[in-house]
């Protein structure tokens, strides 16, 4: 049971934190702003380094209410720019295709399955 609870809670804690804090530019206080900036930087680095998107995948940004969605119209950005497939200069291979959701131009895999392997081994 404990393992099942961990499997349920861990990704959901990641998801809750990401949805609430990622690109949240209107926090109630400075401490929250500092936390939001930290979460945003961490997720940006994770998505760029591991070629992944969100916790479970790009649909996280569309399925749930989030600070990111408040800041970005869905028609403009279905998911963060860091979800786009990048070239060797770390620029989107084809930003137009990424924003339009053309397969192969954005990362389909969620980040949790990539980071949960190393976490579960400890």
């Amino acid at each position: 049971t404990a393992a099942t609870q961990q499997d349920f809670f861990t990704p959901n804690l990641f998801l809750k934190q990401m949805l609430e804090r990622y690109q949240n530019n209107s926090p109630p206080n400075n401490d929250d702003q500092w936390k939001n900036n930290g979460v945003t930087k961490t997720w940006d680095r994770l998505m760029l380094q591991d070629n992944c998107c969100g916790v479970n995948g790009p649909s996280d940004w569309q399925k749930y209410t989030s600070a990111f969605r408040t800041e970005n119209n869905d028609a403009d950005y279905p998911w963060p720019r860091q979800c786009c497939v990048m070239n060797n200069l770390k620029e989107p291979l084809n930003l137009e295709a990424c924003k339009l959701g053309v397969p192969g131009f954005y990362h389909n895999q969620g980040c949790y399955e990539l980071i949960s392997g190393p976490m579960n081994r400890h």
Partner: antibody, heavy 121, light 113 residues
């Protein structure tokens, strides 16, 4: 039907700037990125960059990063490209172009007639 | 940047002849996400803007005569005109439509004897 209207020609002085226009009609302007392409007799076709009219986001070919500035005016469904610090190398035909369909990001299916820019003292 | 190399630079043929022109890219244009090659062919007649002929390397744009055929995958592509007509006099360009910056080949000029 889809139309991209561009002025026929612009004569400009070296060192000055010029703002080229591309007026779109026959479709929802916000739904399609606008692309700009340069053509010179020897150099052929060069892709300058593109702009998303819905939010103004741009992507530039590095070769044109300091030369071209892309903007849009949603109220008049017009895309603009400003070229700065003009030299004889900037004398060319400049086209605006749009994708063929909203779902696909590839192939430029609609083109303006092009604006001939002549840089001369 | 992806470099697009077209050959030959020009060719002169008689009406009714079969013509093939080549386009090679310095990197693969195959998108593994949808298994499509992001290679486009355009035809440009004197005094006109380029006109879309073929996209995804082999899909003919509606209204384009079936004598025009695109083929190839990855880095090697070919445009074939099965029976050249007088109105096919033009420059033909291939374009990388896969990654920024989108790049064009230098063109193949088709002349009719």
């Amino acid at each position: 039907q889809v139309q991209l209207q561009q002025p026929g020609a612009e004569l400009v002085r070296p060192g000055s700037s010029v703002k080229l226009s591309c007026k779109a009609s026959g479709y929802t302007f916000n739904s399609y990125w606008m692309h700009w392409v340069k053509q010179r007799p020897i150099k052929g076709l060069e892709w300058i960059g593109n702009i998303d009219p819905s939010d103004g986001e741009t992507y530039y070919n590095q070769a044109f990063k300091d030369k071209a500035t892309l903007t849009v005016d949603k109220s008049s469904s017009t895309a603009y490209m400003q070229l700065s610090r003009l030299t004889s190398e900037d004398s060319a035909v400049y086209y605006c172009a749009r994708r063929g369909t909203a779902q696909a990001t590839t192939w430029l299916g609609y083109w303006g007639q092009g604006t001939l820019v002549t840089v001369s003292a | 940047d992806i470099v697009m190399t077209q050959s030959p630079s020009s060719l002169t043929v008689t009406a009714g002849e079969k013509v093939t022109m080549s386009c090679k890219s310095s990197q693969s244009l195959l998108n593994s996400g949808n298994q499509k090659n992001y290679l486009t062919w355009y035809q440009q007649k004197p005094g006109q803007p380029p006109k879309l002929l073929i996209y995804w390397a082999s899909t003919r744009e509606s209204g384009v005569p079936d004598r025009f055929t695109g083929s190839g995958s990855g880095t090697d592509f070919t445009l074939t005109i099965s029976s050249v007509q007088a109105e096919d006099l033009a420059v033909y360009y291939c374009q990388n439509d896969y990654s920024y910056p989108f790049t064009f080949g230098s063109g193949t000029k088709l002349e009719i004897k």
